[in-house]
Amino acid sequence: MAAFAVEPQGPALGSEPMMLGSPTSPKPGVNAQFLPGFLMGDLPAPVTPQPRSISGPSVGVMEMRSPLLAGGSPPQPVVPAHKDKSGAPPVRSIYDDISSPGLGSTPLTSRRQPNISVMQSPLVGVTSTPGTGQSMFSPASIGQPRKTTLSPAQLDPFYTQGDSLTSEDHLDDSWVTVFGFPQASASYILLQFAQYGNILKHVMSNTGNWMHIRYQSKLQARKALSKDGRIFGESIMIGVKPCIDKSVMESSDRCALSSPSLAFTPPIKTLGTPTQPGSTPRISTMRPLATAYKASTSDYQVISDRQTPKKDESLVSKAMEYMFGW
């Protein structure tokens, strides 16, 4: 859990991930126009990738491409379109020195404010003390307790639970999500929500202040939804929303509720039936890995403004290659 705001370490600037296992390129001949500038003695322009700043997308960021494009036409500029997700975790700490050499001006430098503790509304400051296993790798932090910026996804592991939903997805309307109660009041809130119908199952968050509840019927769930914003126990305002966490629903569906409970329907005079078979397969409340991957996909979407240059494979060029060794 250490170091939420630390920039992810990418490969070193000089490393070439495509070198290993790649086919060797044709031997360069006398035609120097096919040689990249850095092989001809030119000083390469320093390229510093600029990750997305906290305050918003930075435009015109160039992606580093392999300089070893020998044997083809000169590389075309590739401009990535920024796929910014609102509320996505920042990749730069607000404590990093933004105006470091080579970075130029970013949106933050022009309007930096002193002592920013909470950036924008969704981000919440959580105090951390260096030396307690939460080192922030920042010289400014040494010996000073200060705020670590947590993204909503870090605060709430289900922040991205709706990201994987598509228009074709069918959500189970008998599930609701209840939130906003203190952890100590969870069982009390559960008692209250069992008044609105037969709860078959509920899944508690590991932080304890929200839960997914499955009712026996959609009608009962709708009744629970109508309690959104209601105050319980004089001081606890509760939110109730339809559950959008597919993983909880799907794992519950796999349990195959063979006999939904008819419990507490007074006219029926049968013995008590459980709402759940005892051999219920265990389900996990963690997000499926796929969700996590979807939430952390690349911030930059590469869009080439021209067709990618291909090596000329015509008969004439092959003859020229054979004759001149190009």
């Epitope: 069982s187 037969n198 508690m204 419990a263 459980p274 709402t275 759940q276 265990r282 389900i283 409340t285």
Partner: nanobody
Framework: QVQLVESGGGLVQAGGSLRLSCVGT????????MAWYRQAAGKEREVVAG???????HYADSVKGRFTISRDNAKNTVYLQMNSLQPEDTGVYCC??????????????WGQGTRVTVSS
């Protein structure tokens, strides 16, 4: 597999007492919560009393001081002692037990209910 069977209901005069029992056929001693609910004709279900996670108890305002919920883990039983019964206490009383099946995942079990009628 847990099944809940209630007993102890019946007809009683106003001011009288009844003791409801809910026996779990299966281990309910580790229950997360245990509660009694009631539903009167034409009314919504309401929580009467509950033993919350941690052992504290909760009572509806209308029964405070008159009803007492308790549990006997050795007998896998939850009780509801009802004193000074009033006609408005009439209804079907149902037992509800919540058991943690896996970490953070809880299964809910309901009894069929036992009818309590308080005549004036």
């Amino acid at each position: 597999q847990v099944q809940l069977v209630e007993s102890g209901g019946g007809l009683v005069q106003a001011g009288g007492s009844l003791r409801l029992s809910c026996v779990g056929t299966g281990n309910i001693s580790s229950a997360y919560t245990m509660a009694w609910y009631r539903q009167a004709a034409g009314k919504e279900r309401e929580v009467v009393a509950g033993i919350l996670n941690g052992g504290s108890t909760h009572y509806a305002d209308s029964v405070k001081g008159r009803f007492t919920i308790s549990r006997d883990n050795a007998k896998n039983t939850v009780y509801l002692q009802m004193n000074s019964l009033q006609p408005e206490d009439t209804g079907v009383y149902c037992c509800h037990v919540v058991i943690e099946s896996t970490r953070f995942v809880y299964d809910h079990y309901w009894g069929q209910g036992t009818r309590v009628t308080v005549s004036s």
